[in-house]
Each structure stands twice: as structure tokens, then as C-alpha cells.
């Protein structure tokens, strides 16, 4: 048999066929589903959830549907012991506190087990002290109030407003800058967008919303207490002491209501410049402590969540591939929410229900895909993507040695302007090809294709009549995928107008508001974006599932090694003098990107011209393919991130959302100026300049002709 | 000068209907809920009925819902309530409130009110 | 719904006496507004989300609490002070109001 008659229809047919049977009034009835009650991860509702999905998966018609459980460190607030910040006057009076909770949205206040607003895994403490305003908390912003204005955070409880970087990267910054406790809070400059109504009238984030998430810095390592491993029933774990990533400090959410109260008083220096500014009515003075009158009042936090190890769940399908069984394609979302998840994580979740339902239907009509495909439900995402990094910590043999791809399916929106796509060079080609075949969902783009609304509206800033394609960097499940093994990975959503809209993310991420009724009012009535990412989405899986040659193009991932190293480069050339004095040089870097730019070039060559009819050859140059991105992984790691071994990506030191290229020497290169041992730190720019030339060179060599 | 006037109320008959009115000056009328708060004689505040910026949603007290309609003329800056089946229950002065936090309520300028009286 | 508990229901104080009034909520609420209102007039914003003072409210009034429990104070009382007092909760529908705290010079 070909390879085409293994699957039943021509691939053409296929696709075809999958895409015609995505509906959006699926994915919105699925939606609506999966959001009436709350879902926090470890919680009965979302036990009950999961096993819903892994029966409704099998009537889909997936081969096999599983539970795969793990006892993973989470975080919950003390129900009988509430959190909060309060004023405190000099006799030491609580004469003002935060809110306790959000009131409900409309049709919701009946429900219970609504978890209020925390940072997750904050440890408990009732700090006191004067406030510091950081801005974002950003490594910039320390160095600006450290340096510059020379004011000491040490022992200050500190209010930083979100956005920008991730909130695990604020508290880090602000427990090196020696603070007792530190405060998040929603500035209506980064959560409201002028001209829409707060929820339930409009998008916006109102006063007494607020974002809950995780503060940890696992860098990669899963549940806290099993680093490496997964945490199963007989696991060996860790004291708390030693648990990976958990804050020092008590750390607590609020929403612009009561940070008016916090930042109205305070005193001290003015703010450095009108960066620092948001659009409260307050001077958003920096600090130390609060102004004239109000000087003898302090700011107390009453922190008292607990860190429980609790039993999660993911949902494992499988639809077995027809001709290459042991090789896997993965489309993983998770389940769990902060409440509802109106966005996040059930507008991907039912988009994914959707593309299984669809898969299934063609699997009941006799066909089958030429690979396996894996879909996912993974629980505790919230919590420091557990269950994705348990789950894969556990196959990570299997997964290193069979994984073709992995295809992430998180929120579907964040916005309804255009598709946004992070991904492996490796993808691009797939994703452009493939964006030409669908419809654009968007006004004024009938009868066009999504990627030409998608180059108008967001274009590269490097190729003209491309679209833009992001980095990969971190805060979702295919960091371990990706980050840790090596496996070619991608995501897409709809996003929102990045040059109108400089709020982050969307204004009711995380919060109570993240209703059904914000994305069917708001977002999409008409769920047409939805089923445009699920078209997306599913169509990845499709090609890379059922492609006789997979569709990754390796030439792509040439062009950005030479992009990415002529950017370290230049910022190493900031430092002429010191290159020349420690004799710094990019040579065997660049050369070993002319290698691989040529070896590729070499391979897609023959990968035009080979016998596709010879199933050991055709398997060999597979092979190669799947096995370029896992060639970049270094088994040792980034410098004390052990489980970040992609040596070309790794989410930022400062910002874990965001991807960085050549990680390790940038990292080595960073703030090099103020490192008390020059020597020392440019030795360590020459050392990952080694690591990243050779890992380069290595990969190269995985192209070339096998003997 | 921000006002609240609302229309006569009067005597009616139970079981008959009524429409009070109030109209508003001195603020961008489409930018506010608005609301109907009354008050017994000698007692209580009690909520009535709320209504967003563009009349779009409505929101009321569940004992009254099936009787009275909230209503918003927005080109005209006039609330409505409109009160039918109307009980002796109903007796009370009907103020108009400006909401100023939106959907959650705080009522932060109120009309001088109206009186209610239903008797036969 | 939720039901707010004023106390007490009427009180009288002397002119430059500290006043609390307290209002409790069948259930935790998120903030606590509080009304003025004199015979014959409409009610007066008084305190708004929970520890605000509305536009012309003297400073001698403050608000607090959290949960289910929430306070006015006034730290020196005046004649002009004598009112009833309503608490409203904001945190879902129905919105309530409490039965009103009297409050008399003595």
C-alpha cells in the first residue's frame, strides 16, 4: 500500500473534509459548556470536567481516552482566613482594607466556590512597612529606582502595577531587591481601553476586578517538589525548603479601586518620567512611604494561603496513526481556570473539543491519519503549567524519540483583530501555505485569504508581504515540548490591534469577568475567529499528522540563526574594548550559521528529489526532519535553568512570556558593565559563545547526507 | 448644576398603571446607569430597578419585575418607570438616582422624588 | 439576597462624641456605600466604596471594614449631624440598603 491509500482518501480530500466539518456553533456551544461553574485546578468540578471530556472524546471516536493523574504542590487561599492589605495607623489600626473579593458578574452570584483573587503560592506573612511604587517591577525599573534615584527597596513592602513581564519575574525582581512583601494591582492604563464600558457592559476591567496567577519561577521544572520527575505515587519529594521557584514573600493582587487608596498618600521622590505614570487620579509618587499627614500610617499585608499537594488530572486521547503508529503529533490545551475561563483557557478547550469531534467523524467515515495524533487536556496550567510538564516528564523518553510536533491550544482570543502565530522556523512555511488556503474571518477581507488579512494588519518587520511570526517564549504548556525536549512546536489565537491597544494582554485576564457571556457579547458573537483558530490549529495537526513529507522546512530556521546572530552580535559590539581585551569573537558562530544556512540549503535540495515511494528513505529524511529541533537541546542547560536546553530559544530571564534568542549568550552579555569580575563574565560570553557554535554546528550536521 | 427632576406622581387606583418620568441636566446622560430607589413612608430605602448606558439591560428588584418597567430616552435624557397591576404596597416617594460605578450601584446624585399613593 | 443589618436603629450622641454605626451583611460583601438623609430630603451620598468621603462630606466621617462588617465613624459628633444613616451593599443584585441607623443630638 502507499501511503495514500493507508489513510483512505487523498490528502487534499482530507483536509478538505476536516475543515468543512469545524462548525462555530460547536465551539460556542462547547464553550458555553465548559463555563458555568468554575474549574480551579485540584477541585472536584474540575475532576468532573475532565471526565467528561474523556467520555465525550470517546463517543468522538478516538481509539483510546485516559486519565493520567499527578500529586502536584498547589496553592489555595485560607476559606476561613481571608487575605488582605490593609492602612494602618500609627496605634496601629486597620483604617483601611482591600476588598476581600470581586463582586460577582450578572447571573453569577449565586455561584459558589468562586476562589477569590491571590497569588498563587505566595507564601504567608503579615509584613508591614512603608510602600515603594516600582512601575512594572521590571529589571529596568529596579535599576532606575536602585541606581538612578538611588532608593532602597530593602525592607519596604512594595505595589507594582501588572503588565509588561510576567507577574513570577516582578516578585522575583522585588525579592532580590530586598522587599518584604509585594503587592500586584491593575492600573486602568495597561486594563481599560478608552472608549468601552467595564464588564457587564463592555470589555474593560472594572475598579474592583482583579488578576489572579501564579508567582512562581520554576524555570521549567513542573511541580515544585519533583524536579525532572514526574510526581507520581511513588515519587520522592522535596521539603518544602527546597522546593523549585517558590516566592519568599507574601505577594497579593488588588484592583484599581483599592490601589487608589494605596497610591493616592504615598510620598517621597516624583515619579522618574511619565513612563512610570497610569491613569489613576494619584501623583504616582514613588516613595518611601506616604506623604506629610498620613507619614506615621503603614501598609500591613495579611497573607495566609496554604501550599497542599493535590491530585490533577490531564485527559490523554489517541487517534493511532495508519502508517507511522510511533510517531506523534500533539495538540495539548489545558482545562483548569482561575473561575470561569470564559477566554481563558475554554475558548481553546472548545476549540479543541471541536477538532477531535471533527477527526472523529472522519475516523468513524474509515479514515486515519498517517501519524499518530495526541490530544490533551491538561490540568493545572494555572499553577506553573503542571500538568503539561508531569505528563511529559513521565513519556519524556517516548516523546524525545517519537515527538513530531506540538501544537499548543490555549485561549483562541485575546482580541479580534488578527491571527497572532508564535512558532519554530520550522513551521513557518506550513503556517503561511496553510494560512492561504482558509477564508478571512475579518471585515472588509471577504472572500480574501487569512493570510492576506493577516500580512495587512500585522506584517513582518523583516520580510515585506509576510506576516509577522513571534518567538516562542514561555507562560504555556508547550514550554516543556519545546524548551525542555526539543520538540518543533507552535501556537495561534486571534489577537487584538497591538498598535491602538498597549493594555496587556486583555483586561479581564484572570479575573471573575472572564465569562461565556464577555465572548459571546464582546469578542465574538458570531464565534467566526474561534473557528478560524480552530481551523488553524486543526489544520496544523492535519499537515503534520498526515503529510507524506513533514511540512517543516528547515531553510527558515538557517535564516533566523543568521538574524539572531547578527543581533547578539551587535549588542556584544557595545562593548568594543572589552571584546578586544578578552579577545571576544562571534567567527565560530557565524560559521557554523554558513554551514548550517549551506547544509540546508543541500537538504531541501534532496528533499525535492528523493523516491517518496521508498518507505526507508522517505522515513530517513522524516527522520531529519523531526529530529533538527531536538538537536538544538544541550542536555546540560542554560546556566543555572536546567530544564531550559533549547540553546537557540529560552523565555527570557526578565520576562518569561517572552522568547530571547541565543539565551545563553545573551544572558552572559547582560548588564555585563556592572559585573564585579569582568574577566570572569566575559569568559562566560566566550564559553556560550563555544556552547552556541558548536550546538549550531552539531545541528547542521544532522542535515547532512547520512553516509 | 447636575439635577434630577422626576414628573408628579399622585393617586392611583390598585391595580391600575402609572408612568413616572425623570428627566436629567448638567451630565452626559448616556454615560450613567441610572436607577429607581422608594421609600415608605417612615421607612427604608428599597432598590427598584436599574438600567444600563444604552437601556440594553435592565436589572430589578424579583418581587417587582413581572410590574414595572425600566426604560431610558437617551436622545431626550428621561428615565421611565413604568408601574402597572400597582398594590398599596407600591405607596412611596420614587426617586431617580444617578449610578456612578456602573452596574455595581452607587447612586451619587438623586432627584428630590415623587410620591406614589395607590388607595381606592 | 443579601441582607444588611444596621446598629443600632436609632442612638443619640453629644456634641463632640465619637459615633460608630455599623451595618453587617448576610454575606461577605466586596465595598459598602453609606447614605445621608434628612426629613424631607432626598438621601445624600455620604461614603463610597466603602472608606471614600463623597464630595462636601466633612472629614470628621470615616468608613472601614471588610466582609461581612463594615462601620461609619464620625470622630467628633456635631449638631448638623443628626440624620438618618443608610448602608448599601455593592456586590450583586438585588442591590440592598440597610433599615437606617437614626441618629440624634443629645
Known amino acids: 500500500k502507499s501511503s495514500n491509500e493507508a489513510t483512505n482518501i487523498t490528502p487534499k480530500h482530507n483536509m478538505k473534509a476536516f475543515l468543512d466539518e469545524l462548525k462555530a456553533e460547536n465551539i460556542k456551544k462547547f464553550l458555553y459548556n465548559f463555563t458555568q461553574i468554575p474549574h480551579l485546578a485540584g477541585t472536584e468540578q474540575n475532576f468532573q470536567l475532565a471526565k467528561q471530556i474523556q467520555s465525550q472524546w470517546k463517543e468522538f471516536g478516538l481509539d483510546s481516552v485516559e486519565l493520567a493523574h499527578y500529586d502536584v504542590l498547589l496553592s489555595y487561599p485560607n476559606k476561613t482566613h481571608p487575605n488582605y492589605i490593609s492602612i494602618i495607623n500609627e496605634d496601629g489600626n486597620e483604617i483601611f482594607n482591600t476588598s476581600l473579593f470581586e463582586p460577582p458578574p450578572p447571573g453569577y452570584e449565586n455561584v459558589s466556590d468562586i476562589v477569590p483573587p491571590f497569588s498563587a503560592f505566595s507564601p504567608q506573612g503579615m509584613p508591614e512597612g512603608d510602600l515603594v511604587y516600582v512601575n512594572y517591577a521590571r529589571t529596568e525599573d529596579f535599576f532606575k529606582l536602585e541606581r538612578d534615584m538611588k532608593i532602597n527597596c530593602s525592607g519596604k513592602i512594595v505595589i507594582a502595577r501588572y503588565g509588561k513581564v510576567f507577574r513570577g519575574n516582578k516578585v522575583k525582581n522585588a525579592q532580590l531587591a530586598g522587599a518584604k512583601g509585594v503587592i500586584l494591582y491593575s492600573d486602568p492604563a495597561d486594563y481599560f481601553a478608552p472608549g468601552v464600558k467595564s464588564y457587564p457592559d463592555g470589555w474593560n476591567l472594572p475598579g474592583g476586578g482583579v488578576q489572579r496567577g501564579n508567582i512562581l519561577n520554576l524555570n521549567g521544572a513542573g511541580d515544585p517538589l519533583t524536579p525532572g520527575y514526574p510526581a507520581n505515587e511513588y515519587a520522592y519529594r522535596r521539603g518544602i525548603a527546597e522546593a523549585v521557584g517558590l516566592p519568599s514573600i507574601p505577594v497579593h493582587p488588588i484592583g484599581y479601586y483599592d490601589a487608589q487608596k494605596l497610591l493616592e498618600k504615598m510620598g517621597g521622590s516624583a515619579p522618574p518620567d511619565s513612563s512610570w505614570r497610569g491613569s489613576l487620579k494619584v501623583p504616582y509618587n514613588v516613595g518611601p512611604g506616604f506623604t506629610g499627614n498620613f507619614s506615621t500610617q503603614k501598609v500591613k499585608m495579611h497573607i495566609h494561603s496554604t501550599n497542599e499537594v493535590t491530585r490533577i488530572y490531564n485527559v490523554i486521547g489517541t487517534l493511532r496513526g495508519a502508517v507511522e503508529p510511533d510517531r506523534y503529533v500533539i495538540l495539548g490545551g489545558h482545562r483548569d481556570s482561575w473561575v470561569f475561563g470564559g477566554i481563558d483557557p475554554q475558548s481553546g478547550a472548545a476549540v479543541v473539543h471541536e477538532i477531535v469531534r471533527s477527526f472523529g467523524t472522519l475516523k468513524k467515515e474509515g479514515w486515519r491519519p498517517r501519524r499518530t495524533i495526541l490530544f490533551a487536556s491538561w490540568d493545572a496550567e494555572e499553577f506553573g503549567l503542571l500538568g503539561s510538564t508531569e505528563w511529559a516528564e513521565e513519556n519524556s523518553r517516548l516523546l524525545q524519540e517519537r515527538g513530531v510536533a506540538y501544537i499548543n491550544a490555549d485561549s483562541s482570543i485575546e482580541g479580534n483583530y488578527t491571527l497572532r502565530v508564535d512558532c519554530t522556523p520550522l513551521m513557518y512555511s506550513l503556517v503561511h501555505n496553510l494560512t492561504k488556503e482558509l477564508k478571512s474571518p475579518d471585515e472588509g477581507f471577504e472572500g480574501k485569504s487569512l493570510y492576506e488579512s493577516w500580512t495587512k494588519k500585522s506584517p513582518s518587520p523583516e520580510f515585506s508581504g509576510m506576516p509577522r511570526i513571534s518567538k516562542l517564549g514561555s507562560g504555556n504548556d508547550f514550554e516543556v515540548f519545546f524548551q525542555r525536549l526539543g520538540i518543533a512546536s507552535g501556537r495561534a489565537r486571534y489577537t487584538k490591534n497591538w498598535e491602538t491597544n498597549k493594555f496587556s494582554g486583555y483586561p479581564l485576564y484572570h479575573s471573575v469577568y472572564e465569562t461565556y457571556e464577555l465572548v459571546e457579547k464582546f469578542y465574538d458573537p458570531m464565534f467566526k475567529y474561534h473557528l478560524t483558530v480552530a481551523q488553524v490549529r486543526g489544520g496544523m495537526v492535519f499537515e503534520l499528522a498526515n503529510s507524506i513529507v513533514l511540512p517543516f522546512d528547515c531553510r527558515d530556521y538557517a535564516v533566523v540563526l543568521r538574524k539572531y546572530a547578527d543581533k547578539i552580535y551587535s549588542i556584544s559590539m557595545k562593548h568594543p574594548q572589552e571584546m578586544k581585551t578578552y579577545s571576544v569573537s562571534f567567527d565560530s558562530l557565524f560559521s557554523a550559521v554558513k554551514n548550517f544556512t549551506e547544509i540546508a540549503s543541500k537538504f531541501s535540495e534532496r528533499l525535492q528529489d528523493f523516491d517518496k515511494s521508498n518507505p526507508i528513505v522517505l522515513r530517513m529524511m522524516n527522520d531529519q526532519l523531526m529530529f533538527l529541533e531536538r538537536a538544538f537541546i544541550d542536555p546540560l542547560g542554560l546556566p543555572d535553568r536546567p530544564f531550559y536546553r533549547h540553546v537557540i530559544y529560552a523565555p527570557s530571564s526578565h520576562n518569561k512570556y517572552a522568547g530571547e534568542s541565543f539565551p545563553g549568550i545573551y544572558d552572559a552579555l547582560f548588564d555585563i558593565e556592572s559585573k564585579v569580575d569582568p574577566s570572569k563574565a566575559w569568559g562566560e560570553v566566550k564559553r556560550q559563545i563555544y556552547v552556541a557554535a558548536f550546538t549550531v554546528q552539531a545541528a547542521a550536521e544532522t542535515l547532512s547526507e547520512v553516509a | 448644576e447636575v439635577k434630577l427632576v422626576e414628573s408628579e406622581g399622585g393617586l392611583v387606583q390598585p391595580g391600575s398603571s402609572m408612568k413616572l418620568s425623570c428627566t436629567a441636566s448638567g451630565f452626559t446622560f448616556s454615560d450613567y446607569y441610572m436607577a429607581w430607589v422608594r421609600q415608605v413612608p417612615e421607612k427604608g430605602l428599597e432598590w427598584v430597578a436599574n438600567i444600563n448606558y444604552d437601556g440594553s439591560s435592565t436589572y430589578y428588584l424579583d418581587s417587582l419585575k413581572s410590574r414595572f418597567i425600566i426604560s431610558r430616552d437617551n436622545a431626550k435624557n428621561i428615565l421611565y418607570l413604568q408601574m402597572s397591576s400597582l398594590k398599596s404596597e407600591d405607596t412611596a416617594t420614587y426617586y431617580c438616582?444617578?449610578?456612578?460605578?456602573?452596574?455595581?450601584?452607587?447612586?451619587?446624585?438623586w432627584g428630590t422624588g415623587t410620591t406614589v399613593t395607590v388607595s381606592s | 439576597q443579601i441582607v444588611l443589618t444596621q446598629s443600632p436603629a436609632i442612638m443619640s450622641a453629644s456634641p463632640g462624641e465619637k459615633v460608630t454605626i455599623s451595618c453587617s451583611a448576610s454575606?461577605?460583601?466586596?465595598?459598602m456605600y453609606w447614605y445621608q438623609q434628612k426629613p424631607g430630603s432626598s438621601p445624600k451620598p455620604w461614603i463610597y466604596?466603602?472608606?471614600n468621603l463623597a464630595s462636601g462630606v466633612p472629614a470628621r466621617f470615616s468608613g472601614s471594614g471588610s466582609g461581612t462588617s463594615y462601620s461609619l465613624t464620625i470622630s467628633s459628633m456635631e449638631a448638623e449631624d443628626a440624620a438618618t444613616y443608610y448602608c448599601?451593599?455593592?456586590?450583586?443584585?438585588?442591590?440592598?440598603f440597610g433599615a437606617g441607623t437614626k441618629l440624634e443630638l443629645k
Open positions: 448599601q451593599q455593592y456586590h450583586s443584585y438585588p442591590l440592598t
Open positions: 438616582a444617578r449610578d456612578l460605578d456602573g452596574y455595581y450601584g452607587y447612586f451619587d446624585v
Open positions: 454575606s461577605s460583601v466586596s465595598y
Open positions: 466604596r466603602t472608606s
